[in-house]
């Protein structure tokens, strides 16, 4: 099979193919104006249009604008990718009452359970808090939910759980209009009893649940709201999210309210010098020396080859599992045969520094 022979001439004479020395394989040449979705395309569907930044290629092959999460009540759930839109959701402490494609048209604050009711299900980005009547065993002095303990599993609720209705608690479901802090503050004062993290059913230590609006007096569970592209670090400071704007980096996780953006080396590259939430230096994937492969003859590939039938015999040059750990049967400095195909197959985490040993084989840098 031509694809299994490392000979360049097998691809020549066909204008729709080219030879990639790095993977020792014939590749499909994407037509003008189309870009490969993997290092060595194998067919026309491995090519795609390239859209402008902040646009994605939809199912009809059109470049479509990614939605923006710039409204105060929204946060980015997933970033804008080449083939999918950015997805926004209501920020912590709020839920979506009117959904929109890849976003939410209207977010409301989670309701507080009224006196005599306790949280059955805490509010999420999609659903409001669900309350249920406190059990008969609970003290009638339990006037506000934050003082009430959840009933033990042995108690039977008196009625079916019900979400707090906006009709009965209009103040508690006040929508947040883009950027009006007064509305947020008003909503905050109306809907939150002092020190009431349990009103949404979680302990106050959970940072994902603290309200994002300014604190009412006496409330200890609020957090600062940072500027766009900043996050609240563990010390409670607004810290700039790292930027992945360098050509050799791609965004791995977006900038969130409580965590930085993280960057990784783009497919086909590996991190040589790590940095906090990023990589200071990306280098092209090291290619395994041909002599380190168990069966070099009749091979066009760099990844593991198996000889039939005994499975499990590992060649010298072998990718580690996807979590980057070496198999138990091998030594920690086992050489890695790196496959430079799609980013999902990288055998070494791209944030892990790699050093080349004296044999020319890459080894994980423990430092």
């Amino acid at each position: 099979f031509p694809q299994d022979r490392p000979f360049e001439d097998t691809c020549h004479g066909n204008p729709s193919h080219y030879y990639d020395k790095a993977v020792r394989r014939c590749c499909y040449r994407c037509p003008m104006g189309l870009f490969p979705t993997q290092q060595c395309p194998q067919r026309p569907t491995d090519c795609r249009k390239q859209c402008e930044p902040d646009y994605y290629l939809d199912e009809a092959d059109r470049c479509t604008a990614c939605v923006t999460c710039s409204r105060d009540d929204l946060v980015e759930k997933t970033p804008c990718a080449w083939n999918s839109s950015r997805v926004c959701e209501c920020r912590p402490g709020m839920f979506c009452s009117t959904s929109a494609v890849n976003s939410c048209a209207r977010c409301f604050f989670h309701s507080v359970c009224p006196a005599g009711m306790i949280v059955k299900f805490p509010g999420t980005a999609q659903k409001n808090t669900v309350c249920e009547p406190a059990s008969p065993g609970v003290s009638p002095a339990c006037a506000s939910p934050e003082n009430c303990k959840e009933p033990s599993s042995g108690t039977i609720p008196q009625a079916k759980p019900t979400p707090v209705s906006p009709a009965t608690s209009s103040a508690s479901t006040m929508p947040v209009r883009g950027g009006t802090r007064l509305a947020q503050e008003a909503a905050s004062k109306l809907t939150r009893a002092p020190d009431s993290p349990s009103s949404v059913g979680r302990p106050s230590s959970d940072p994902g649940l603290s309200p994002t609006q300014p604190c009412p007096e006496g409330s200890g569970d609020c957090r600062k709201q940072c500027e766009p592209d900043y996050y609240l670090d563990e010390a409670g400071r607004c810290t700039a999210c790292v930027s992945c704007s360098r050509d050799d980096l791609v965004e791995k996780t977006p900038c969130a309210w409580n965590s930085s953006r993280t960057c990784e080396c783009r497919p086909g590259m590996i991190c040589a010098t790590s940095a906090t939430n990023s990589c200071a230096r990306c280098v092209p994937y090291p290619i395994c020396a041909a002599e380190t492969v168990t069966k070099p003859q009749d091979m066009a590939e760099k990844d593991t080859t198996f000889e039939a039938p005994p499975l499990g015999t590992q060649p010298d040059c072998n990718p580690t599992p996807e979590n980057g750990e070496a198999p138990a049967s091998t030594s920690p400095t086992q050489s890695l045969l790196v496959d430079s195909q799609a980013s999902k197959t990288l055998p070494i985490p791209t944030s892990a520094p790699v050093a080349l040993s004296s044999t020319g084989k890459p080894v994980l840098d423990a430092g």
Partner: antibody, heavy 116, light 107 residues
């Protein structure tokens, strides 16, 4: 020499799940697409679906609700599961590799018979 | 999905004769078409890819032509080993589809 070896149950009862596995020996696994194709007795070929080394799948619409293709890259294997089989699923099932040269490498085929 | 229609269904010829097999697509597939040969009890074998390129080891008497919707596989002079079923296959649009086949039999 690169080879595809496939195996799985050959006789099934209606409503059972067909399960086949294909192993790649002597060649690369990543960077290619791995398909399942079937051929009812005396009839033509039907592409069922594919997977790549990173687990990305595509299925033919007529079977999409019943078919699952999975991959085990560490073993260089990929598998087909087809649920709720009927007599119409009786066929020779082939695994195949797709490259720039289309389906350039095929397994020998496994006859799966669905009969009560 | 793209439907590939092969004609004729059966072609009865003698060794040494010329065989012309047709494959028509319901919509354009550009040149993203392959031809396969299948003998009884065997898996299909790739003959032609990208409409007109012979696969490795395929003799020069087999040739492919066409683009868009009309494709032809030609066997210039039939050898005994050429009597088999031939399928065309497209990979221009999901799902990949095959023609129903043309059987080339000895007259």
């Amino acid at each position: 020499q690169v080879q595809l070896q496939q195996w799985g149950a050959g006789l099934l009862k209606p409503s059972e799940t067909l399960s086949l596995t294909c192993a790649v020996y002597g060649g690369s696994f990543s960077g290619y697409y791995w398909s399942w194709i079937r051929q009812p007795p005396g009839k033509g070929l039907e592409w069922i679906g594919e997977i790549n080394h990173s687990g990305s799948t595509k299925y033919t619409p007529s079977l999409k609700s019943r078919v699952t293709i999975s991959v085990d890259t560490s073993k260089h294997q990929f598998s087909l599961k087809l649920s709720s089989v009927t007599a119409a699923d009786t066929a020779v099932y082939y695994c195949a590799r797709e490259t720039v040269y289309y389906f350039d490498l095929w397994g020998r085929g496994t006859l799966v018979t669905v009969s009560s | 999905e793209i439907v590939l229609t092969q004609s004729p269904a059966t072609l009865s010829l003698s060794p040494g004769e010329r065989a012309t097999l047709s494959c028509r697509a319901s919509q354009s597939v550009s040149s993203n078409l392959a031809w396969y040969q299948q003998k009884p009890g065997q898996a299909p074998r790739l003959l032609i890819y990208d409409a007109s390129n012979r696969a490795t080891g395929i003799p020069a008497r087999l040739s492919g032509s066409g683009s868009g919707t009309d494709f032809t596989l030609t066997i210039s002079s039939l050898e005994p080993e050429d009597f088999a079923v031939y399928y065309c296959q497209q990979r221009s649009n999901w799902p990949w589809t095959f023609g129903q086949g043309t059987k080339v039999e000895i007259k």
